[in-house]
């Protein structure tokens, strides 16, 4: 998004770890109702891979029609393919559902990449490997789309888990999760563990592989190690957070922290990459290039266009730096950091010509709509979307890909001053993101 005005940027914001221990909430605190530690029936209910999205099985209509639905925390519509399409094996057939109700209203949704159009209605919806409830939810029946469905992705719809403010056609269309919480006793919280494979998966492997877990209504302690650290949800539209500092291999990027959140920073399971504002991207790439300078990579690699390949099993992970994002903590002047490895930001892809090699794409890219913490970030962590307490929790994922020398990390507390000033006050518009 282009904005004519940029707010004056603040400088001199400290974000250095001072070794000072600040009070924090840990997972030892008394658990709230519904936050029991085990949700066996929901564990491993996601499939997919970071490049094409993670999906959960859902049923719609009466009798139930089973569909695979992309889990997207960067949008707020529940929308399913409802007409034949070359990339869809199945689709929602409204005429076969006795409980379908037509809302007699159209909807059009453009994403960063891809668009769809459809007709609004409501129907009964449930999640077989989720809470044992059925809810009447708004459904957009997708009748037309362009660059939206992905060939071979195995999903037929999208579950927008963000807030009503960004729902289309407007915020009066109640999102699925709001309907779920309103109509049942499910607590207002969900958590995601996205498990990157660490190697490319072919179609049959994706179908057989476990992609992770969406725990609806709670937190499963088996899905993470260490403590959960929470950052406030700045505003309930996207899952907007505030980044206060960025380090590459422990080296501060030393930018005004407002740049990191220009024009927002969001947690988005429906985007593949870690996307960074132009200035931040340029600084980060410069720093990552410098850190990995023992090998030379073509410019196209850093632009995410070209693959780099190594002989199977010889990827030099150690030459690539770790990346740390410091997030605003729950306590004044307190932050914590999440650290990802190259195993997260180098995305494995199949190279047909050299199937013996391990090939990767650089999964950090430039954004004109702020920072997007997409699947490559989320694959390192168990992420708790605690809507009830307006916060997002991060802990090291029990399934993240790492090596014997380094692991993803969530660490704190760190003293960081003036964190509120890191937020950018965006002129009001609405956008949606998806798998870019």
């Amino acid at each position: 998004t282009q904005h004519g005005i940029r707010l004056p940027l603040r400088s001199g914001l400290g974000g250095a770890p001072l070794g000072l221990r600040l009070p924090r909430e840990t997972d030892e605190e008394p658990e709230e109702p519904g936050r029991r530690g085990s949700f066996v029936e929901m564990v491993d209910n996601l499939r997919g891979k970071s490049g094409q999205g993670y999906y959960v099985e859902m049923t719609v209509g009466s009798p139930p029609q089973t569909l695979n639905i992309l889990v997207d925390t960067g949008s707020s519509n529940f929308a399913v393919g409802a007409a034949p399409h070359p990339f869809l094996h199945r689709y929602y057939q409204r005429q076969l559902s006795s409980t379908y109700r037509d809302l007699r209203k159209g909807v059009y949704v453009p994403y960063t990449q891809g668009k769809w159009e459809g007709e609004l209605g409501t129907d009964l919806v449930s999640i077989p490997h989720g809470p044992n409830v059925t809810v009447r939810a708004n459904i957009a029946a997708i009748t037309e789309s362009d660059k939206f469905f992905i060939n071979g992705s195995n999903w037929e719809g999208i579950l927008g888990l963000a807030y009503a403010e960004i729902a289309r056609p407007d915020d009066s269309l109640e999102p699925f999760f709001d309907s779920l919480v309103k109509q049942t006793h499910v607590p207002n919280l969900f958590s995601l563990q996205l498990c990157g494979a660490g190697f490319p998966l072919n179609q049959s492997e994706v179908l057989a592989s476990v992609g992770g877990s969406m725990i609806i209504g709670g937190i499963d302690h088996s899905l993470y190690t260490g403590s959960l650290w929470y950052t406030p949800i700045r505003r309930e539209w996207y899952y907007e957070v505030i980044i206060v500092r960025v380090e590459i291999n422990g080296q501060d990027l030393k930018m005004d922290c407002k740049e990191y959140n220009y024009d927002k920073s969001i947690v988005d399971s429906g985007t593949t990459n870690l996307r960074l504002p132009k200035k931040v991207f340029e600084a980060a790439v410069k720093s990552i290039k410098a850190a990995s300078s023992t090998e030379k990579f073509p410019d196209g690699f850093w632009l995410g266009e070209q693959l780099v390949c190594w002989q199977a099993g010889t990827t030099p992970w150690n030459i690539f730096p770790v990346i740390s994002l410091y997030l605003m903590g729950e306590v004044t002047n307190q932050s914590f950091r999440i650290t990802i490895l190259p195993q997260q930001y180098l995305r494995p892809v199949e190279d047909v010509a050299t199937s013996q090699d391990d090939c990767y794409k650089f999964a950090i890219s430039q954004s004109s709509t702020g920072t997007v913490m997409g699947a490559v970030i989320m694959e390192g962590f168990y992420v708790v979307f605690d809507r009830a307490r307006k916060r997002i929790g991060f802990a090291v994922s029990a399934c993240h890909v790492h090596d014997e020398f380094r692991t993803a990390a969530v660490e704190g507390p760190f003293v960081t001053l003036d964190m509120e000033d890191c937020g950018y006050n965006i002129p009001q518009t609405d956008e949606s993101t998806l798998m870019t």
């Epitope: 007409a83 034949p84 059009y108 453009p110 960063t112 990449q113 159009e117 009748t143 660059k147």
Partner: antibody, heavy 117, light 112 residues
Framework: EVQLQQSGAELVKPGASVKLSCTAS????????IHWMKQRTEQGLEWIGK????????TYDPKFQGKATITADTSSNTAYLQLSSLTSEDTAVYYC??????????WGQGTTLTVSS | DIQMTQSPLSLPVSLGDQASISCRSS???????????LHWFLQKPGQSPKLLIS???NRFSGVPDRFSSSGSGTDFTLKITRVEAEDLGIYFC?????????FGGGTKLELK
């Protein structure tokens, strides 16, 4: 309010090229498609082609391939139609049109192009 | 290319009359997704065309309910139940099922 503001009338010589513009307000062109139509007096409407400004992908009526080039600049929220090797056959009113995947919902006011020596 | 043929070429009416315009396509307009992308536009003198109806029968927002349209495959009809002065102009049918998109030659609705 959604509007498509087209550039002013053009009088150009045969053989020359011209670039017509269409500036959008009230929406982002990257969220829609922009089409160009040609209307000659007593000749009805012809679809020239369209662009998806989100990625620059274009589709043309084969009969306008080589004659027309559609581009878009998302930073200025403007779409363009360039017409080359102009002849009197190109004299017409040209419209830019916004569409979703289905609805051709907003039309520009039209630009009159006259090709004459 | 799909040929779109409209009839009549001109339709003289009195205010309050019912008017009916036909549009025929040289090939079926049913898309592989099952939908039919046949649309109607009205161009008033000195103005740009405006969308009236999309996908055979869906009235665009703000279009009065005296406009209706029906049809399938290759044969379509636009009906205006009680013609008002603001309805006068040239009506075009158009298809966007097949590329290139094509328009009918137009039907001029005018006063008798």
């Amino acid at each position: 309010e959604v509007q498509l503001q087209q550039s002013g009338a053009e009088l150009v010589k045969p053989g020359a090229s011209v670039k017509l513009s269409c500036t959008a307000s009230g929406f982002k062109i990257k969220d829609y498609y922009i089409h160009w139509m040609k209307q000659r007096t007593e000749q009805g409407l012809e679809w020239i082609g369209k662009i998806d400004p989100a990625d620059g992908e274009t589709t043309y009526d084969p009969k306008f391939q080589g004659k027309a080039t559609i581009t878009a600049d998302t930073s200025s929220n403007t779409a363009y139609l360039q017409l080359s090797s102009l002849t009197s056959e190109d004299t017409a009113v040209y419209y830019c049109v916004r569409s979703t995947l289905v609805l051709f919902d907003y039309w520009g006011q039209g630009t009159t192009l006259t090709v004459s020596s | 290319d799909i040929q779109m043929t409209q009839s009549p070429l001109s339709l003289p009416v009195s205010l309050g009359d019912q008017a009916s315009i036909s549009c025929r396509s040289s090939q079926s307009l049913v898309h592989s997704n099952g939908y039919t992308y046949l649309h109607w536009f009205l161009q008033k003198p000195g103005q740009s065309p405006k969308l009236l109806i999309s996908k055979v029968s869906n009235r665009f927002s703000g279009v009065p309910d005296r406009f209706s349209s029906s049809g399938s495959g290759t044969d379509f009809t636009l009906k205006i139940t009680r013609v008002e002065a603001e309805d006068l102009g040239i009506y075009f049918c158009s298809q966007s099922t097949h590329v290139p998109y094509t328009f009918g030659g137009g039907t001029k609705l005018e006063l008798k």
